[in-house]
């Protein structure tokens, strides 16, 4: 199974200090992965290469994303990417890419969380994306 | 074979101007790769996807890591990641990720070297890690 | 098929506001991919993991690369990497890595474009490279 996703939108819930991205498939092979709004549901357990990139346009001193999984009654951070940002708005433009190999369980929900309220993201599909490759 | 490693600790030997990370397996499939202190020994020769991320909290003007291999009487750099760092300690927080596909030989020892003495690293397993996927 | 490429040189054509890299193979397995000067020709259609890193030594406020494909009468950006750069030449040293999974067609030409005239790149094979893995 292979899935490459691109953004639909990004939102911060009221009173939330995080921003989440809603995803749609751009490339899909196999039935083992299912985009579900702000998350991706794992249908086939196994070892996956996960990758995530977010394009930030924000002068907050550091920006980044956390890729986490929720399932079997617990939430767990898998990996994160962190980027220091310039304080000048014209210069504050950085993509942050990270990836890793993880064992995912059936029913796990994977999501990308930016731990900032109303983070300024560029939701171009070339700059912000999320992907899975079953190994 | 698949191996995803996370840090145990990082040290600079006396009189050394480099910092090395000691690794432990977080995910392992197959017997082709063996964590050995500061290095990973290749048991099965072949083509591997290697990935490395280090999370830096250091105001040194540029930081980064080198992934190198030692074996068969030679030592060489495979790839490196470089990140310019802000001079203010509160802002100096950057992950540096890189990856590539390389042919590794039986007996090769792979290691991650930060070419700075006593580099200030964040050894969280979500921010600093090393991985191998046999293709 | 697997292909890992390293730079031969990088050039900006007269009156062009982009810099392109010319590539040579460092590792090749299979016949599905062919280095062709500034591009890589896809011989075997399929789903590929593509990765790109460029090492920048440039004080231009933001630098980065675009990985694009040309084929079937159209040009398309697949993904890009963006890095804000310090204004001081001694600090302006950043690698920019990105990757993703894409469906490539037979005859597609893949290239790495830096959308700056005469971009200052470090063409070390350890810092600037391009790769493909057929999944």
């Amino acid at each position: 199974s292979v899935l490459h996703l691109v953004p639909i939108n990004a939102t911060s819930k009221d009173d939330s200090d995080v921003t989440e991205v809603m995803w749609q498939p751009a490339l899909r092979r196999g039935r083992g992965l299912q985009a579900q709004g702000y998350g991706v549901r794992i249908q086939d357990a196994g070892v996956y290469l996960l990758y995530s990139q977010v394009l930030f346009q924000d002068v907050t001193f550091t920006m980044g994303q956390v890729v986490s999984r929720e399932g079997q009654g617990r939430q767990e951070t898998l990996f994160r990417c962190i980027r220091s940002m310039p304080s000048h708005p014209d210069r504050a433009y950085n993509s942050c890419y990270s990836a890793g190999v993880f064992h995912l369980h059936q029913g796990d929900i994977l999501s990308v969380i930016i731990p900032r309220a109303r983070a300024k993201l560029n939701l171009s599909p070339h700059g912000t994306f999320l992907g899975f490759v079953k190994l | 074979s698949v191996l995803h490693l996370v840090p145990i600790n990082a040290t600079s030997k006396d009189d050394s101007d480099v910092t090395e990370v000691m690794w432990q397996p977080a995910l392992r499939r197959g017997r082709g790769l063996q964590a050995q202190g500061y290095g990973v020994r290749i048991q099965d020769a072949g083509v591997y996807l290697l990935y490395s991320q280090v999370l830096f909290q250091d105001v040194t003007f540029t930081m980064g890591q080198v992934v190198s291999r030692e074996g068969q009487g030679r030592q060489e750099t495979l790839f490196r990641c470089i990140r310019s760092m802000p001079s203010h300690p509160d802002r100096a927080y950057n992950s540096c990720y890189s990856a590539g596909v390389f042919h590794l030989h039986q007996g090769d020892i792979l290691s991650v070297i930060i070419p700075r003495a006593r580099a200030k690293l964040n050894l969280s397993p979500h921010g600093t890690f090393l991985g191998f996927v046999k293709l | 098929s697997v292909l890992h490429l390293v730079p031969i040189n990088a050039t900006s054509k007269d009156d062009s506001d982009v810099t392109e890299v010319m590539w040579q193979p460092a590792l090749r397995r299979g016949r599905g991919l062919q280095a062709q000067g500034y591009g890589v020709r896809i011989q075997d259609a399929g789903v590929y993991l593509l990765y790109s890193q460029v090492l920048f030594q440039d004080v231009t406020f933001t630098m980065g690369q675009v990985v694009s494909r040309e084929g079937q009468g159209r040009q398309e950006t697949l993904f890009r990497c963006i890095r804000s750069m310090p204004s001081h030449p001694d600090r302006a040293y950043n690698s920019c890595y990105s990757a993703g999974v894409f469906h490539l067609h037979q005859g597609d030409i893949l290239s790495v474009i830096i959308p700056r005239a005469r971009a200052k790149l470090n063409l070390s094979p350890h810092g600037t490279f391009l790769g493909f893995v057929k999944l």
């Epitope: - | 050394s16 009487g73 030679r74 030592q75 060489e76 750099t77 070297i113 | 470090n122 070390s124």
Partner: antibody
Framework: QVQLVQSGAEVKKPGSSVKVSCKAS????????IHWVRQAPGQGLEWMGW????????NYAQKFQGRVTITADKSTSTAYMELSSLRSEDTAVYFC?????????????WGQGTLVTVSS | EIVMTQSPATLSVSPGERATLSCRAS??????????LHWYQQKPGQAPRLLIY???TRATGIPARFSGSGSRTEFTLTISSLQSEDFAVYYC?????????FGGGTKVEIK
Amino acid sequence: QVQLVQSGAEVKKPGSSVKVSCKASGYTFTDYTIHWVRQAPGQGLEWMGWIYPLRGSINYAQKFQGRVTITADKSTSTAYMELSSLRSEDTAVYFCARHGAYYSNAFDYWGQGTLVTVSS
Amino acid sequence: EIVMTQSPATLSVSPGERATLSCRASESVDNDGIRFLHWYQQKPGQAPRLLIYRASTRATGIPARFSGSGSRTEFTLTISSLQSEDFAVYYCQQSNKDPYTFGGGTKVEIK
């Protein structure tokens, strides 16, 4: 562009030592091993050993073990080869060479050579 | 150690002719599909220059008239049409096993 520039010719007495330098420029010095190769007059090429400047790791050919010392100064991007207990058969041109790592596995750049003459 | 043997020791060729140089290793210099065999050119008073690496890949700036072939223990350097600047000594070298070793060289001279 990549350059390796070596120190000048030396004349030495038997039993003494010689230290030859090799200054690298045009690339990241710590990323590549520097090797030393010598060539006696009218003879072929003989490999002596290498240093990986990033870590200071070294490897010497068995023939020269105990007599050769290869070092590197990262601050000046310079490698050094010192050969001790010199004898007349050590008269040769000594070359430093950069090893092109995984993508060539060969000596892709060479210094111009340093002639060392051992004579009483 | 791996012993590299080059033949002939001297090759006399006229300009424009083809030259074929041989290099034999005492044991295989192939490792996991990679051929750790390289060719260098050396002119009098100069350092060697890399021509061919990994048995068959031309180094940057090397003309297409130079080509390399072979595997395991038998390798060949071919110069398709000798130019005046090609008259020199050619060395093969293996980097599969420590210590790295060179062949004794083939001198290509004008006939």
